[in-house]
Interface confidence: low
């Protein structure tokens, strides 16, 4: 026989299927061209010393053969003794260790037996009614296909499904769609209405995520102000990555998770813009404001839950940063100025109370004043930090204040509102003999002294009411006692206490008159 | 007849860059997916980047991540990847291929079953 013949004899081995598990399978047989025709098969096992043979039964019932060699596809025309416009039969028998292997059958005409390919370029995926949807177009000159999908995931094998026949220039697939696990897919292609038609091969993978994306489990850490206002924010543990099967691994488009950080400052309300979404990777600085933090997951179809936190305001205050002035028209902070065109965000809120009560105003932006300071004033009218109590100040700078990330913290402290220096005026003054020449004074903790850093110190005064002689004693903001020594039985004096801050001086309390009673001996 | 060809590898030393280009004639088609493959000696060949030619979507494999970045310019039919930061792992012989493709969707078929491949151009990196 000629090799490019179908060889009408016994094949030159005996006839005797192992039944091993390997050997050939995958037969595929198309016309490539007008008179030539291509089959092409696989062969699963060892190769070595394997000879394949390609054979062929007529529907007069005549059967033939094509030696192939050690190849797995093989070519011949339309002389080469094998109908192609009726009916054949074909399969591959493999010989190999003294026995032969035998692939299934395929029956088919192979005039009409076109080479089909899987879908071509894109896949779209979306998702509709619960189940995915796939679609794409139709590769060119192919309008006419029964089409199949096999998909797993990463812990389950292939399971096959069917997508109907398809008769249009798109063709599309219903597919089911997994809750919480990736899946791979692979869509493969026949001729419609053809007899024994080949499958296409599998095309490319399409890499689909869940339909809910993972919760991102995540964990943050902050790190300290630094000298300019601002603190990092630092991504402690990176989201956990979604376990693909094994034909996503690597490069798979379509099942990434994008996670994004979405910021909400809680401090100075009165800003223009309160939120800003991130990428999860880069990670920002903060002011020393309060915070929330919210780690969003998605993927291509949308949105999953999200983690929050909690990020406290940095509450380490700068004592003596602020000056405040009170006059006549109102009262003026000043503060060292950060640069020019500089917004403040200045915030105040009375201490002890809920964090919903913290008022805030926005300043024009502003360039430092002939001795480096910004400042801001209002009116006694506006009632702003009017009573007379503690509050805690903030002031926070930006160049750009609509850009969320970009604020700093220029300062923190505490302030004693209204009239702090009769407000903070000691009460309760008690004069107590000590001992033959001293006496020990006591005095009720200043309303100031619930203010950390604004009580700067007590001034205890001692008058001599016949001398007229006055003597002035400083005593430590966190003390309420002194002793006076030094003074003479039977002389009046009266004693008063005034609490002093940085910036004022207070008003002494009510004066108390004592004597230290002469001593008669026996 | 389409045809790929690649060009700018060379050998570099670890850390340094190299621009990759990859000019692509005889494809009429608008709408395509493009990509970057590589194969080291003794192991398969593995995906780098690709780009879609509707909306210019870019994928990159997690190892090259943050150094390589694919463009294209579709007036000159040649796409690009710029390599910074070189690894000695980054060694091998550098393809282009191309995929016939008609929208944009969440990736494209970024894989080494592309239908039209390049001769290679190859990127040696060593001290």
């Known amino acids: 026989c000629r090799t490019s013949e179908c060889c009408f004899q016994d094949p030159p081995y005996p006839d005797a299927d192992s039944g091993s598990a390997s050997g050939p399978r995958d037969l595929r047989c198309y016309r490539i061209s007008s008179d030539r025709y291509e089959c092409s098969w696989q062969y699963e096992g060892p190769t070595a010393g394997v000879s394949h043979f390609l054979r062929c039964c007529l529907s007069s019932g005549r059967c033939c053969y094509f030696a192939a060699g050690s190849a797995t596809r093989l070519q011949f025309s339309d002389q080469a003794g094998v109908s192609v416009l009726y009916t054949v039969t074909l399969w591959v028998e493999s010989w190999a260790r003294n026995q032969t292997e035998k692939s299934p059958e395929v029956t088919l005409q192979l005039y009409n037996s076109v080479k089909y390919e899987p879908p071509l370029g894109d896949i779209k995926v979306s998702k509709l009614a619960g189940q995915l949807r796939m679609e794409w177009e139709t590769p060119d000159n192919q309008v006419g296909a029964e089409v199949q999908f096999r998909h797993r995931t990463p812990s389950s094998p292939w399971k096959l499904g069917d997508c109907g026949p398809q008769d249009d220039d798109t063709e599309s697939c219903l597919c089911p769609l997994e809750m919480n696990v990736a899946q791979e897919f692979q869509l493969r292609r026949r001729q419609l209405g053809s007899q024994g038609s080949s499958w296409s091969k599998w095309s490319s993978p399409v890499c689909v995520p869940p339909e809910n994306p993972p919760q991102p489990q995540v964990r943050f850490s902050v790190e300290q102000l630094g000298q300019d206002g601002r603190r990092r924010l630092t991504l402690k543990e990176q989201p956990t990555q979604l376990e693909l099967p094994e034909g996503c691994q690597g490069l798979a488009p379509g099942t990434e998770v994008t996670y994004r950080l979405q910021l909400h400052m809680l401090s100075c309300p009165c800003k223009a813009k309160a939120t800003r979404t991130l990428h999860l990777g880069k990670m920002p600085y903060l002011s020393g404001a309060a915070y929330n933090v919210a780690v969003i997951s998605s993927n291509q179809f949308g949105p999953g839950l999200n983690q929050t936190w909690h990020i406290p305001a940095d509450t380490h205050t700068e004592p003596v940063a602020l000056n405040i002035s009170v006059g006549t028209n109102g009262t003026t902070m000043y503060w060292p100025a950060r640069a020019q065109s500089m917004t403040y965000c200045i915030e105040w809120q009375p201490v002890g109370q809920d964090g919903g009560l913290a008022t805030c105003s926005l300043t024009a932006p502003q360039d430092p004043d002939p001795a480096g300071m910004a400042t801001y004033s209002w009116s006694r009218e506006s009632g702003a930090m009017g009573q007379e109590k503690c509050y805690y100040i903030t002031i926070f700078a930006s160049a750009h204040p609509e850009k969320l990330t970009l604020w700093s913290t220029v300062l923190s402290t505490y302030h004693f509102g209204g009239n702090a220096s009769a407000a903070g005026t000691p009460h309760h003054v008690s004069v107590k003999n000590h001992s033959l020449d001293s006496v020990s004074v006591d005095w009720a903790p200043s309303l100031l002294s619930t203010c950390p850093g604004v009580l700067k110190e007590y001034v205890v005064r001692c008058r001599d009411e016949d001398s007229k002689q006055v003597s002035e004693h400083p005593v430590q903001p966190t003390e309420t006692q002194v002793t006076l020594s030094g003074l003479r039985a039977g002389v009046a004096y009266t004693v008063q206490v005034r609490a002093d801050t940085a910036w004022l001086r207070g008003v002494w309390s009510q004066p108390q008159r004592f004597s230290i009673e002469v001593q008669v001996s026996d | 007849q389409v045809q790929l060809q690649e060009s700018g590898g060379a050998l570099v030393q670890p850390g340094g860059s190299l621009r990759l280009s990859c000019v692509v004639s005889?494809?009429?088609?608008?709408?395509?997916?493009i990509g970057w493959f590589r194969q080291a000696p003794g192991k398969e060949r593995e995906g780098v980047s690709c780009?879609?030619?509707?909306?210019?979507?870019?994928i990159y494999s997690d190892s090259v991540k943050g150094r390589f970045t694919i463009s294209r310019d579709n007036a000159k039919n040649t796409v690009y990847l710029q390599m910074n930061s070189l690894k000695p792992e980054d060694t091998g012989v550098y393809y282009c291929?191309?995929?016939?493709?008609?929208?944009?969707?969440?990736?494209?078929?970024?894989?080494?079953?592309?239908?039209?491949w390049g001769k290679g151009t190859p990127v040696t990196v060593s001290s």
């Open positions: 291929a191309l995929d016939r493709g008609r929208r944009t969707i969440i990736g494209y078929a970024c894989y080494a079953t592309m239908k039209y």
């Open positions: 005889g494809f009429t088609s608008d709408y395509f997916a």
């Open positions: 780009i879609g030619s509707s909306d210019g979507s870019t």
